[in-house]
């Protein structure tokens, strides 16, 4: 059966075998700035190109043991959520991965900046179709990281980021607080904001919308056919990156403002239980859960 | 995310170091009345002191960025400090990434073309 998260973003009356929206995002390239990935995993093989970009800090601790499957875990799962053969949102999208997070999932603002600059230079050297950049990471508020995101967005790139897993105001984090970035919070199968240990999804006016982010089945780096369930606002952001890829594939010239309106228009509204959020944040937090437009194979009909 | 909001800094720390006119050896003085600012992460454990992103004013060319970085190195050396330029930015933002002592921040903020300087900090998988 179809995983709950794909069912949630796919409007009612889809059958599992029918989930095949228009060309699956094939005109769009999605850049993933994350950990290293297992590019030969069956879910993403041939769909993800590993760039030679790497800018990561040393792992903490003298006894840290670099294990490939652990190093690749986060990025592989997200690549699968965006474009995986079986459990992906935009099954036709092609991806490029940049390594900005180390084996402990840690990176730097400067490394992320250099990664964003790499994407911009690639775009200038070889202009392709629409670009989506997925930033499944968060740090403290950073003026420079937000500024770089703004510049890239103004160059026509769609940036999607995780709201953060700190059960806090997303405006205190970057790139979540950058106005030009689509910032995504996480909800679960019950349309509740996701709790992660003692923390959970961020919230507030810097969040644009929510998406499935708990118990998300995706590619596991433990083996080339393994699957694993992961949770977080990164997973939520990956869903929106996939939806954006599909919308842009259908309408490649959409501006960021237009795409944002599409995402809002097709979202499920007022389904999130707002009691989870601090009282002063409820009115500021958008009650929107991302969804795909509800038709599959559709060319505009013309009488 | 969420367009249309004011760009608030929240509890983001901004340390404004006023420019002092007695700085020696500047071929180009900064524009009158402008104050370059220093920023660092409000979450202390995430700070990475010793590495700084020097962001230059919007229209600064790559050659000017390189010249500004070299000037910083020369002035730091004159004071007995080692610095290392790790990356020169161009394409998105003009500027450079430098490894240096925090003692040099005041000096760096007085360099021509400098808009602001941000201390590097950590980001994490979510």
């Amino acid at each position: 059966s179809i995983p709950w998260n794909l069912e949630r973003i796919t409007p009612p009356r889809y059958r599992a075998d029918e989930y095949q929206p228009p060309d699956g995002g094939s005109l769009v390239e999605v850049y993933l700035l994350d950990t290293s990935i297992q590019s030969d995993h069956r879910e993403i093989e041939g769909r993800v190109m590993v760039t030679d970009f790497e800018n990561v800090p040393e792992e903490d601790g003298t006894r840290f043991h670099r294990q490939a499957s652990k190093c690749d875990s986060h990025g592989t799962h997200l690549a699968g959520v965006v474009s995986g053969r079986d459990a992906g949102v935009a099954k036709g999208a092609s991806m490029r991965s940049l390594r900005v997070l180390n084996c402990q999932g840690k990176g730097t603002v400067s490394g992320t900046l250099i990664g964003l600059e790499f994407i911009r230079k690639s775009q200038l050297v070889q202009p392709v179709g629409p670009l989506v950049v997925l930033l499944p990471l968060a740090g403290g508020y950073s003026r420079v990281l937000n500024a770089a995101c703004q510049r890239l967005a103004r160059a026509g790139v769609v940036l999607v980021t995780a709201a953060g897993n700190f059960r806090d105001d997303a405006c205190l984090y970057s790139p979540a607080s950058a106005p030009e970035v689509i910032t995504v919070g996480a909800t679960n199968a019950q349309d509740q904001p996701v709790t992660l240990g003692t923390l959970g999804t961020n919230f507030g006016r810097c969040v644009d919308l929510f998406a499935p982010g708990e118990d998300i089945i995706g590619a596991s780096s433990d083996c080339s056919t393994c699957f694993v369930s992961q949770s977080g606002t990164s997973q939520a952001a990956a869903h929106v990156a996939g939806i954006a890829a599909m919308m842009l594939s259908a309408e490649p010239e959409l501006t960021l403002a237009e795409l944002r309106q599409r995402l809002i228009h097709f979202s499920a509204k007022d389904v999130i239980n707002e009691a989870w959020f601090p009282e002063d944040q409820r009115v500021l937090t958008p009650n929107l859960v991302a969804a795909l437009p509800p038709s599959t194979h559709e060319n505009l009909y013309f009488q | 995310g969420a367009m249309g909001q004011e760009d608030e800094d929240g509890d983001y720390e901004e340390l404004v170091l006023a420019l002092r006119s007695e700085e020696d050896g500047l071929a180009e003085a900064p524009e009158h009345g402008t104050t370059a600012t220093f920023h660092r992460c409000a979450k202390d454990p995430w700070r990475l002191p010793g590495t700084y992103v020097v962001v230059l004013k919007e229209e600064t060319h790559l050659s000017q960025s390189e010249r500004t970085a070299r000037r910083l190195q020369a002035q730091a050396a004159r004071r007995g400090y080692l610095t290392k330029i790790l990356h020169v930015f161009h394409g998105l933002l003009p500027g450079f990434l430098v490894k240096m002592s925090g003692d040099l921040l005041e000096l760096a903020l007085k360099l021509p073309h400098v808009d602001y300087i941000e201390e590097d900090s950590s980001v994490f998988a979510q």
Epitope: A250, A257, H265, K269, P294, S295, E298, L300 | -
Partner: antibody
Amino acid sequence: EVQLVESGGGLVQPGGSLRLSCAASGFTFSRYWMSWVRQAPGKGLEWVANIKHDGSEKYYVDSVKGRFTISRDNAKNSLYLQMNSLRAEDTAVYYCARESNWGFAFDVWGHGTMVTVSS
Amino acid sequence: QSVLTQPPSASGPPGQRVTISCSGSSSNIGSNTVNWYQQLPGTAPKLLIYSNNRRPSGVPDRFSGSKSGTSASLAISGLQSEDEADYYCAAWDDSLNWVFGGGTKLTVL
């Protein structure tokens, strides 16, 4: 063939009510936002209301809020517009239109049904 | 009074090119795509251009659309007598309404 057919128009007195229907065929009705658009005699097009594919969201132009109600029955492939407290200025041809999902436009229109509000 | 502003009329001889403008605001054209509809006399409107500049199948490439900021325009080249119709621009508005232009009556001279 993809088709929308409106019915239920007619002559009604000011303050009266009328219920318009739109029968959809040739496509999966339950997957589309649907709209009502009207055109007063000799005038331009004016959007009246729309409804989400599952009926969970409804929006109206200010001039009909509180008087008109849009609804749908996906099992019957039908769209409805209940019009109460009708006024002379509601006189128009009412079109049922499908909103395309991947182009965000009215890509299928019915032939229209005439509503005349007059004493 | 329509939310989007169009000239009430436009005209041109056969074979010529004519352009129809449509002006809106940041809440409609500025943040959403523009569509154009053609309404031949006595018939229902039909979609001519969607997503600013895309043509549904069956629409001749003589029709083209563009958008810049809060304005859009429809261009018809190689004007033909069967192009004589009313043309309407439309866009979704952030206030959760579809908005139309007042319509432009095109006359082929």
